[in-house]
Interface confidence: low
């Protein structure tokens, strides 16, 4: 197991008497019901709490709220239930937080049933005051920020109305009717989708996808026979109804919607679906379901375009349509990724992949554990790791894994050791190299956040009784230091710290319960004073990222280039600070077999890196369809991957011909449809 | 199969007022825009405004507006276009038209009525 | 609003003779234009909108084309039956408005 406070580790000095006098506790006056937690902005302190409490009465039900404020990371609260006129606030919308430091906030009230409009309360000034708005209609989902323009809102009416306001939800304008989904896009453009005769579920499959670049004023049929469609980077996606039959295939346009190519990606049926598992710039994951009800599909990683796609994982776990996955983007560290797989005797299995998708491996197993009952061979297994699936199924996982960007290259996550996911109670493992190593950090299942981009993690045990001691370590989980912070355990019900990983403030929350009465508290901890002094040049050392041979001349080479991190010592207990920037320095790679992906008409044979053509298209002409045009590929078989910087070594040729031939995928554009009247 | 029909034609004087119906059949009367449009003698068509039936939403041409009043009754799937005092110059037949799609005010006519000729004379 | 102004505003041809009416908009309008054609004593009818998609059932000698500003209405090849008037519409901001309507008839 993990050191513990035994002699391996020095205690960090006299840190009880430090972490008393920054320990603040606030009793909430209310009944217990829900709480919901929002930060407000960057680097404010701003907290904004709205407590709910519901009274179930014979006839209806009765709804108490109460909004609290906190201007210093929530050390001390103020009641601002007046601000909003004392009215119930709609948990179900939570609390509508403005993009980037806008310091906006929306709060979608309970209004009685015979109103025209719901109501929403307005601050721009990190809910210092409110405006109380009442709307011309009543509201399906929480207020849509504009990614570009904080005044710029959205909303779906419960009549399917899609309504924009330009002025910050003071005034309102129905932009279209009848419409199922609404999606903010690049430039303040709006996605949706329309239904023409019955309802968004009788449609399905013949609806219209839509564009709005001028907030509604013009229109823009940019695709039709729509089952759905989602947007990820650059790219936007529609999944389309095939002409003959009841199969649909996904589609993607890089210019918003103007012009369509058909994905190369398999067609799926009546009960299949895809997903975007995860997208940037550069390329995307889309997982492409297994016909029948078998709970797993595939994992394809697009080119640059997002139309050729490699197969990158089969049998990935993935149950059903908004169903489960455990996918999960490592943001500790560039092109790692960790899923699950179903293997064949339906025991659950943990992947990662270091390249973006280009090749997946087990977990090694961490050196400091023991393969459990799981394991055939009690000296070779592997770890597995516990995510949203394992927490669906109401496992004792109290939290998904955690990565922070600016704490490189840790990644913390429940998991088990043996050959595949255990039942048992699973033990906390850490990871300092993105995912390649890992240590046993804590025994049983724990809560867990990191503090100052990585210079002090947090945990709590997870229990069923009340609990009253924090852990924390300043060496990324070697060892572990507890404080009290409470004579008087509380019910914990979760770990609140300010997005981003910079602050040094924990909150824990939970509630007190006496013979009568139960009442939530928070206990707001800042480490300020055990991370005495800011971190200076002799605390970081360099580290190079994917570093697996060091003798390898080109030893940490992934998509083309190597990253070297300033890191902190392990060994160092010090500030890194609210204004810490990662220092990388990368370098660029020679090109490999590596660095490309197979072309259209090609495969990697398994533990290949060549590429082969498929037996069915040998010796045919490789044609396929771009923006509508028929295309003529010369290709050796690769193309590079999305992202990849190298430079030199391998250069393998290609080279697209247009054919200046019309071809037939391109279902979407209206132009290419003989509308039929209704 | 989608269809517009319109009331017969009115003889009226000025200073009457006149209701004239559009009943839509074959499709869902409450999910598309219907439109009123003007055709005076020997003249081009002028667009007047439109309706949403499903919420009796309207939008008007600034030409039009106050001058006449489109509603629409969803129970009988039937548009109307009135006037309240009648003028010389209201003579035109009148069109209603089904717009492409249950959207907003966007698509083309692509359904119209057979027509209503209005004439105001002394 | 949005004004649109037809050319010609009238147009005599033979039969089997290439038309071409044109139709601009006083802002742009995008894909946002409609063409109906309109027989004596008869109520218009929709031949293509959105600027170039045909209506279903209109003959295939009807086309259209034009982004923006400027759009063109082409008959092909002319036939006795296509003596009508023809308007275009455009829908992309309210009030909707109509062109004036340019009036074809055969030789």
């Known amino acids: 197991s993990a050191p513990g406070e035994d002699e391996e580790c020095g205690r960090v000095r006299d840190f009880v008497a430090k972490l008393a006098n920054n320990t603040h506790q606030h009793v909430f006056d209310d009944l217990r019901g829900s709480v919901s937690l929002s930060w407000v902005g960057d680097s404010t302190g701003v907290i904004l709490v709205l407590t709910t409490f519901h009274v179930p009465l014979v006839i209806m039900t009765f709804g108490q709220s109460k909004l609290y404020r906190s201007e210093d990371y929530g050390k001390n609260f103020k009641d601002i239930t007046d601000l909003i006129n004392n009215t119930f606030i709609r948990t179900e919308f939570g609390m509508a937080i403005g993009p980037e430091n806008s310091g906006k906030v929306v709060l979608t009230a309970e209004v009685s049933g015979g109103s025209r409009g719901g109501r929403i309360f307005r601050s721009s000034d990190f809910a210092k005051n409110f405006v109380q708005t009442d709307l011309p209609f009543h509201p399906l989902t929480q207020m849509m920020y504009s990614p570009q323009n904080s005044d710029y809102l959205l909303a779906l009416s419960t009549e399917n109305g899609l309504w924009v306001s330009k002025n910050f939800g003071g005034k309102w304008e129905e932009i279209h009717k009848a419409v199922c989904l609404a999606k903010w896009g690049s430039d303040n453009t709006i996605f949706f989708t329309t239904y023409a005769n019955g309802s968004c579920k009788a449609d399905l499959g013949a609806l219209e996808l839509w564009r709005t670049s001028d907030l509604g004023k013009s229109f823009k049929t940019i695709g039709v026979k729509i089952y759905s469609f989602g947007l990820g980077g650059r790219f936007l996606f529609a999944s389309v109804m095939a002409d003959k039959d009841t199969t649909r295939r996904i589609h993607v346009s890089t210019d918003q919607g103007d012009t369509w190519s058909m994905a190369q990606l398999p067609s799926v049926g009546q009960e299949q679906f895809y997903s975007i598992l995860a997208a940037n710039d550069d390329m995307v994951f889309m997982h492409v379901d297994e016909p029948g009800d078998t709970g797993f599909g595939t994992i394809f990683t697009s080119d640059d375009r997002g139309i050729v796609y490699s197969k990158s994982l089969d049998r990935h776990l993935y149950t059903t349509t908004g169903g489960e996955t455990d996918f999960t983007n490592v943001t500790s560290l560039r092109g790692v990724y960790i899923t699950s797989v179903l293997s064949e005797d339906n025991s659950i299995q943990t992947m990662i992949t270091f390249d973006q998708g280009g090749r997946w491996t087990h977990l090694r197993k961490p050196e400091n554990s023991e393969c459990d009952a799981t394991a055939k061979n009690k000296n070779e297994c592997s770890l597995h790791i516990h995510a949203s699936y394992s927490i669906s199924q109401k496992l004792n996982v109290p939290m998904a894994p955690l990565s922070e960007p600016n704490a490189v290259g840790i990644v913390i996550a429940h998991g088990s050791v043996g050959d595949a996911i255990s039942v048992m109670v699973p033990d906390v493992y850490i990871s300092d190299d993105g995912g390649y190593s890992w240590t046993k950090m804590l025994e049983g299942p724990h809560y867990y956040t990191i503090l100052d981009s990585g210079g002090i993690i947090v945990a709590i045990e997870h229990s069923s009784r009340p609990i009253n001691v924090i852990k924390f370590s300043t060496d990324e989980g070697q060892c572990w230091q507890t404080y009290t912070f409470t004579r008087d355990p509380i019910y914990f019900t979760g770990l609140a710290s300010e997005p981003g990983a910079r602050s040094m403030n924990i909150s824990i929350w939970g509630f007190t319960e006496s013979f009568l009465t139960s009442q939530w508290v928070s206990y707001t901890i800042d480490f300020k004073d055990i991370l005495e002094r800011n971190c200076e040049e002799k605390d970081y050392t360099i580290w190079l990222a994917h570093s697996t041979d060091p003798e390898d001349y080109e030893d940490g080479c992934i998509l083309g280039y190597k990253e070297q991190f300033l890191r902190l010592r392990k060994s160092s207990v010090c500030q890194n600070g609210r204004d810490y920037v990662v220092t990388k320095q990368p370098s660029i790679c020679l090109c490999s077999l590596e660095d490309f992906l197979c072309d259209f008409g090609y495969y990697r044979p398994e533990n290949d890196s060549k590429c082969v053509e498929q037996p069915e298209l040998k010796g045919h002409d490789l044609e396929f369809c771009l923006y509508g045009r028929e295309e003529h590929l010369t290709t050796n078989g690769y193309r590079k991957i999305p992202g990849d910087k190298c430079q030199g070594g391998v250069n393998p040729v290609r080279e697209v011909k247009d054919l200046k031939k019309k071809c037939t995928s391109n279902f979407l554009s209206p132009e290419k449809q003989n509308s039929k009247s209704n | 199969e989608v269809q517009l029909v319109q009331s017969g034609a009115e003889v009226k004087k000025p200073g009457e007022s006149l209701k004239i119906s559009c009943k839509g059949s074959?499709?869902?009367?409450?999910?598309?825009?219907i439109g009123w449009v003007r055709q005076m003698p020997g003249k081009g068509l002028e667009w007047m405004g439109i309706?949403?039936?499903?919420?009796?939403?309207?939008r008007y041409s600034p030409s039009f507006q106050g001058q006449v009043t489109i509603s629409a009754d969803k129970s009988i799937s039937t548009a109307y276009l009135q006037w309240s005092s009648l003028k010389a110059s209201d003579t035109a037949m009148y069109y209603c038209a089904r717009h492409s799609r249950g959207s907003f005010w966007y698509g083309a006519f692509q359904h119209w009525g057979q027509g209503t000729l209005v004439t105001v004379s002394s | 609003e949005i004004v649109l102004t037809q050319s010609p505003d009238f147009q005599s041809v033979t039969p089997k003779e290439k038309v071409t009416i044109t139709c601009r908009a006083s802002q742009s309008i995008g894909s946002s234009l409609h063409w109906y054609q309109q027989k004596p004593d008869q109520s218009p009818k929709l031949l293509i909108k959105y600027a170039s998609q045909s209506f279903s059932g209109v003959p295939s000698r009807f086309s259209g084309s034009g982004s923006g500003t400027d759009f063109t209405l082409t008959i092909n090849s002319l036939e006795a039956e296509d003596a009508a008037a023809y308007y275009c519409?455009?829908?992309?901001?309210?009030?909707?408005?109509f062109g004036p309507g340019t009036k074809v008839d055969i030789k």
């Open positions: 074959g499709y869902i009367f409450t999910s598309f825009w």
């Open positions: 519409h455009q829908s992309s901001s309210l009030p909707h408005t």
């Open positions: 309706i949403y039936p499903g919420d009796s939403d309207t």
